[in-house]
């Protein structure tokens, strides 16, 4: 009845688990909201209480910890399902309290079905491998804490639907999967199935991740400006539309921010009075190298605009480059009746 610090529904932690598999879910309070851990809270006499709201219901209800074979149990700050059922889907709340203190947070738990090829609505983590690197490994994720170190599970790896056996450059090594000299054909979904015994029962953990082979840092170069270049001159008459594309190639670099921008007479377009618009498009190669194009457009260019300096700039973690566009005013073709006649001495 007393006030409780309610952190609301933590949708950032959209937890998805597979049906008919064990799941261990830590109370998010200690990981993301409170400055102390469960042991400290427990020592201080605080109690952790769990309850839930079923999918499409409003009613909060206690979790039944008296199910056959302890299907749902709590251990310290962890809620255990051994295993999950489809109708365990809902919003779960963990509340830490005593007579003077109360804090709680809710989080959504979705129990997901998978088919025989491990396809499911599960959001998959992406692991990037560098093309042509010698040896790179992925590790079966999120299996810590399910079984003690004395238990030796069996691990089977799959690519898509196929068990990985005698794959030329993909080698299962227990919890790890090694890739030798990765190629783009190694792109795909990889699944590890971990099987372990517990109290006379056998449990399976299924973990799928997406492997994406990307450009290698050894091949990375500073940004390359393909346009503007020295071969193209933007020759316009006043009143015409001026369109200058700035096209830049960026090597893939992990966590690099790629930037392209124009300056006009050394200033950003926003900082000058002329009516200029800039449209950007981005495309990616199969190894996630990036090509950015920014088209600078002046609808009705003036003779003053044609005297300005238009410079395309690009920056990545590999360096910064710039290139000026060649812009000039078109010399109008002579009108015979006036210019040429005058030239011939006509009056």
């Amino acid at each position: 009845s007393e006030r409780c610090d309610d952190w609301g529904l933590d949708t950032m932690r959209q937890i998805q688990v597979f049906e008919d598999e064990p799941a261990r879910i830590k109370c998010p309070l200690f990981e993301h909201f409170l400055k102390f851990n469960y042991s400290t809270a427990h020592s201080a006499g605080l109690t952790l209480i769990w309850y839930w709201t079923r999918q499409d219901r409003d009613l909060e209800e206690p979790i039944n910890f008296r199910l056959p074979e302890n299907r749902i149990s709590k251990e310290k700050d962890v809620l255990w399902f051994r295993p999950t059922l489809l109708n365990d889907t809902g919003n779960y709340t963990c509340m830490l309290r005593n007579t003077t203190y109360c804090s709680k947070v809710a989080f959504p738990l979705e129990v997901v079905q998978k088919d025989s090829c491990f396809n499911s609505p599960m959001k998959l983590p992406v692991h990037k491998l560098y093309i042509e690197y010698g040896i790179q490994r992925i590790t079966c994720p999120n299996v810590d804490g399910y079984f003690p170190s004395s238990v030796k599970p069996t691990i089977t790896w799959y690519m898509g639907c196929y068990k990985i056996q005698n794959f030329n450059n993909v080698i299962p090594e227990g919890m790890n999967l090694s890739f030798l000299i990765a190629l783009i054909s190694n792109n795909g979904n990889y699944t590890c199935v971990v099987t372990y015994p517990e109290n006379g029962r056998t449990f399976h953990l299924t973990r799928t991740l997406t492997v994406k082979v990307v450009g290698s840092p050894k091949n990375a170069v500073p940004p390359v400006i393909h346009s503007p270049n020295d071969h193209v001159v933007y020759e316009k008459e006043p009143g015409e539309e001026l369109l200058i594309p700035c096209t830049v190639y960026f090597s893939f670099l992990m966590d690099s921010r790629n930037e392209v921008w124009w300056t006009i007479d050394g200033k950003k377009p926003d900082d000058i009075t002329i009516d200029v618009t800039i449209n950007e498009s981005i495309s990616h190669s199969r190894t996630e190298d990036e090509t950015r194009t920014q088209i600078l457009s002046i609808k009705k260019v003036t003779s003053e605009d044609l005297k300005r300096s238009y410079v395309c700039h690009a920056r990545s973690a590999k360096g910064e480059v710039a290139k000026a566009a060649k812009v000039k005013q078109k010399v109008p073709a002579p009108r015979y009746t006036v210019e040429l006649a005058c030239g011939f001495g006509a009056t």
Epitope: Y133, G134, I135, N168, N169, L180, I181, L183, S185
Partner: antibody
């Protein structure tokens, strides 16, 4: 100019061993994967083995797995192929080649002949 | 292992004529296909990579096309130095595999 020069070929008895070398010049050797390809007399090309630029990743054709070992010394710009338990069917010209995923085997050596015969 | 099949095994062509060589992969190799030329007693030379991109220094009369499983090498007007054996190779999946070769001979 990119150059690859193989050496170490010769006549060897079945069950014997041979070590081929490939000396590279004209490019940054440590930046490229390298490979061995062989060609039996009057036959087509067969990929034998590949090694990553850093020497950590190695791959082999099934026909040589467990018998051949590819290695490299980036400080010496040299690629090696250690061939053990040689068989008559390993008789071939052995070429080393530079590879990149984007451009396949873009430069080749002139080859060295290995003859396995009693 | 991806099997590469070239046809025909031998192609007899007169100098100045067009030659069309085919290569088929047992499964898709995307556009990760190369063509090599080999003359007697010499090492192979890269002609085409990425199914259609000419390697450095290769004359424009050589062109490649195709993607997936069907590929073609075309020599628009055969010169005397073009009579050789041509191999296709996939580098999409390990092991990288070659076709058995097409011999282009003088008719």
């Amino acid at each position: 100019e990119v150059q690859l020069l193989e050496s170490g070929g010769g006549l060897v008895q079945p069950g014997g061993s041979l070590r081929l070398s490939c000396a590279a010049s004209g490019f940054t050797f440590s930046q490229f994967g390298m490979t061995w390809v062989r060609q039996a007399p009057g036959k087509g090309l067969e990929w034998v083995s590949a090694i990553s630029y850093d020497g950590e990743g190695t791959l082999y054709a099934d026909s040589v797995k467990g018998r051949f070992t590819i290695s490299r010394d980036n400080s010496k710009n040299t690629l090696y192929l250690q061939m053990n338990s040689l068989r008559a069917e390993d008789t071939a010209v052995y070429y080393c080649a530079r590879f990149r995923y984007y451009t396949a085997f873009d430069y080749w050596g002139q080859g060295t002949l290995v003859t396995v015969s009693s | 292992e991806i099997v590469m099949t070239q046809s025909p095994a031998t192609l007899s062509v007169s100098p100045g004529e067009r030659a069309t060589l085919s290569c088929r992969a047992s499964q898709s190799v995307s556009s990760n296909l190369a063509w090599y030329q080999q003359k007697p007693g010499q090492a192979p030379r890269l002609l085409i990579y990425g199914a259609s991109t000419r390697a450095t220094g290769i004359p424009a009369r050589f062109s490649g096309s195709g993607s997936g499983t069907e590929f073609t090498l075309t020599i628009s007007s055969l010169q005397s130095e073009d009579f050789a054996v041509y191999y296709c190779q996939q580098y999409n999946n390990w092991p990288w595999t070659f076709g058995q070769g097409t011999k282009v001979e003088i008719k």
